[in-house]
Interface confidence: low
């Protein structure tokens, strides 16, 4: 007699998560008598997927009526596929007996599940950094299959090249995860900049997913300080101005010191934004020259975003202030601008 063949025509089938998968199987002969069963995997640990005679398989239905006489088609349909259903499925013929004896297996059909990646989530550094420093952004996307995926980084529309990307796990899995780190060099103009992580995958039908992060959360732009002195007023008072410019974020505290003693402390709030996203602030101090016998050392001290203070010190020359002094002059700078480089 002709040897029985169990034919699984497709070596592999690829299905989108949520769809149904059809696994085809036909036999070449009705004899010997005995059932067909479907398994996922081979060997002793294989998993029973469908058995016509007994068991409850709510997601599996036969494609044709297996009870009709002369049926040789034992194909099945599995509904609501998830990545967990991926694997190799075997159609196996048994000879009727007590117990039934395995007679012949099909060659197997590998089911791969196409699952969309999650929307990329971009996270930035935990602490702010200043211009010229490099910060890292991380992008994560999960749950996709197959493993092939493309991830690109952009800053203000320009692709970044200092990127390290890993797809896990390295071996076979029902679904995969991608994690990528991009290193970005900050500039003082980056308050309004944005980084974008773009993920492209076969399941997205050419419409990539994007995750974004604003560099405003990662950057600190330290202030520039300039102290100027206006002309003396008729009442022997000198108006001294401290201009704090081009800083971000807005969190800033300014303290005036007269001869080392705190004269006034102010906090910046509700400042108008410059075009580049930074802020400017001006503070002034009136110094009564006639109340001082010696030169007055004034210090404008700025604490920005919890960083070490930046000082600008200078002297008001008491002897150099006749009442008819001329117009605005820059203060004589007796100290250095102790602006820290962070």
């Amino acid at each position: 007699e002709e040897e029985l063949q169990v034919i699984q025509p497709e070596k592999s089938v690829s299905v989108a998560a949520g769809d149904s998968a059809t696994l085809n199987c036909t036999v070449s002969s009705l004899i010997p008598v005995g059932p067909i069963q479907w398994f996922r995997g081979a060997g002793p640990g294989r998993e029973l997927i469908y058995n016509l005679k007994e068991g409850h398989f709510p997601r599996v239905t036969p494609v044709s009526d297996p009870t009709k006489r002369n049926n040789m088609d034992f194909s099945i349909r599995i509904s609501n596929i998830t990545p967990a259903d991926a694997g190799t499925y075997y159609c196996v013929k048994f000879r009727k007996g007590s117990p039934d004896v395995e007679l012949k297996s099909g060659a197997g059909t590998e089911l791969s599940v196409r699952a969309k990646p999650s929307a990329p989530v971009v996270s930035g550094p935990a602490v702010r950094a200043t211009a010229e420093h490099t910060v890292s952004f991380t992008c994560e996307s999960h749950g996709f299959s197959p493993r092939d995926i493309t991830l690109k980084w952009f800053k203000n529309g320009n692709e970044l090249s200092d990127v390290q990307t890993n797809v896990d796990p390295a071996g076979k899995s029902v679904s995969y995860s991608i994690r990528s780190t991009a290193r970005v060099v900050l500039t003082r103009r980056d308050v309004h900049s944005q980084v974008i992580c773009e993920v492209a995958h076969v399941t997205l039908q050419g419409d990539p997913l994007r995750g974004t992060a604003n560099l405003s959360e990662a950057i600190r732009v330290p202030p520039f300080l300039e102290v100027t002195q206006q002309s003396m007023r008729a009442d022997n008072q000198v108006n001294v101005t401290c201009q704090v410019t081009k800083f971000y974020p807005q969190r800033l505290q300014l303290t005036w010191l007269e001869n080392g003693n705190v004269s006034r402390t102010e906090m910046a709030s509700a400042l108008p934004e410059n075009k580049d996203g930074t802020y400017n602030w001006t503070s002034w101090l009136l110094v009564n020259v006639s109340a001082h016998r010696d030169d007055v050392k004034l210090t404008c001290q700025v604490e920005h975003d919890g960083q070490p203070a930046v000082n600008k010190s200078f002297s008001v020359k008491v002897s150099a202030h006749p009442k008819e002094q001329g117009s605005n002059t820059a203060a004589e700078n007796t100290g250095t601008n102790e602006r820290n480089i962070y």
């Epitope: 998560a17 949520g18 609501n80 596929i81 998830t82 990545p83 699952a115 969309k116 990646p117 999650s118 929307a119 989530v121 935990a126 994560e140 996307s141 999960h142 749950g143 996709f144 679904s175 995860s177």
Partner: antibody, heavy 123, light 107 residues
Framework: QIQLVQSGSELKKPGASVKVSCRAR????????MNWVRQAPGQGLEWMGF????????TYAQGFKGRFVFSLDTSVSTAYLQIGSLKAEDTAVYYC????????????????WGQGTLVTVSS | DIQMTQSPSSLSASVGDRVTITCRAS??????LAWYQQKPGKAPKSLIY???YRYIGVPSRFSGSGSGTDFTLTISSLQPEDFATYFC????????TFDQGTKLEIK
């Protein structure tokens, strides 16, 4: 802008049923799992389970099997929580919350929450 | 089920203070831990995921640390809007579980 918009407060009698809706705005509902979280008056947060919005398959936490049903209507981007045979102890605020990840890799952290729906059960 | 225990259960602090809230899991949850903030009558707000990552839009004064069983949420300089209840949540194992929360009040 991503938002989860829930239906309004409900006052029900014991034995009745209630259906709370959660509409996804600003993203595709089927891209993220949707969780349901209960907060009884003055109490903490209790995870009830989630629904895989891609396959429609629900997963219920112990204690929320039977009377509680998660469902979807993707045509209106809405997830539903139905509670049957209401009891006084079901009085709580019910929140829907979106899972961060897809297919539950980093999936149990919630990134967006609905505003909550107060369900009061009283005779 | 994994039990989550937070300490302290309530805390009084002033604007500008540095505040630390700790959360302990009854078994190893890796870094599958999230932090949420909730104000009275409002929905929770998501702050931190994977133990250390801030969601975009969460101020940098909030930071998370820890792995395994011991985790910390730190607010570096309390602002008036930070007075609320803070919950931690593990999502390493089903069922997902929250702690009972730490209520942060104005001193």
């Amino acid at each position: 802008q991503i938002q989860l918009v829930q239906s309004g407060s409900e006052l029900k009698k014991p034995g009745a049923s209630v259906k709370v809706s959660c509409r996804a705005r600003g993203y595709t509902l089927t891209d993220y799992a949707m969780n349901w979280v209960r907060q009884a008056p003055g109490q903490g947060l209790e995870w009830m389970g989630f629904i895989n919005t891609y396959t429609g398959e629900p997963t219920y936490a112990q204690g929320f099997k039977g009377r509680f049903v998660f469902s979807l209507d993707t045509s209106v981007s809405t997830a539903y929580l139905q509670i049957g045979s209401l009891k006084a102890e079901d009085t709580a605020v019910y929140y829907c919350a979106r899972t961060r990840g897809y297919y539950d890799f980093d999936g149990g952290a919630f990134d967006y929450w609905g505003q909550g729906t107060l369900v009061t059960v009283s005779s | 089920d994994i039990q989550m225990t937070q300490s302290p259960s309530s805390l009084s602090a002033s604007v500008g203070d540095r505040v630390t809230i700790t959360c302990r899991a009854s078994q190893n949850v890796g870094t599958h831990l999230a932090w949420y903030q909730q104000k009275p009558g409002k929905a929770p707000k998501s702050l931190i995921y994977s133990a250390i990552y801030r969601y975009i839009g969460v101020p940098s004064r909030f930071s998370g640390s820890g792995s395994g069983t011991d985790f910390t949420l730190t607010i570096s300089s309390l602002q008036p809007e930070d007075f609320a209840t803070y919950f931690c949540q593990q999502y390493n194992t089903y069922p997902l579980t929250f702690d009972q929360g730490t209520k942060l009040e104005i001193k």
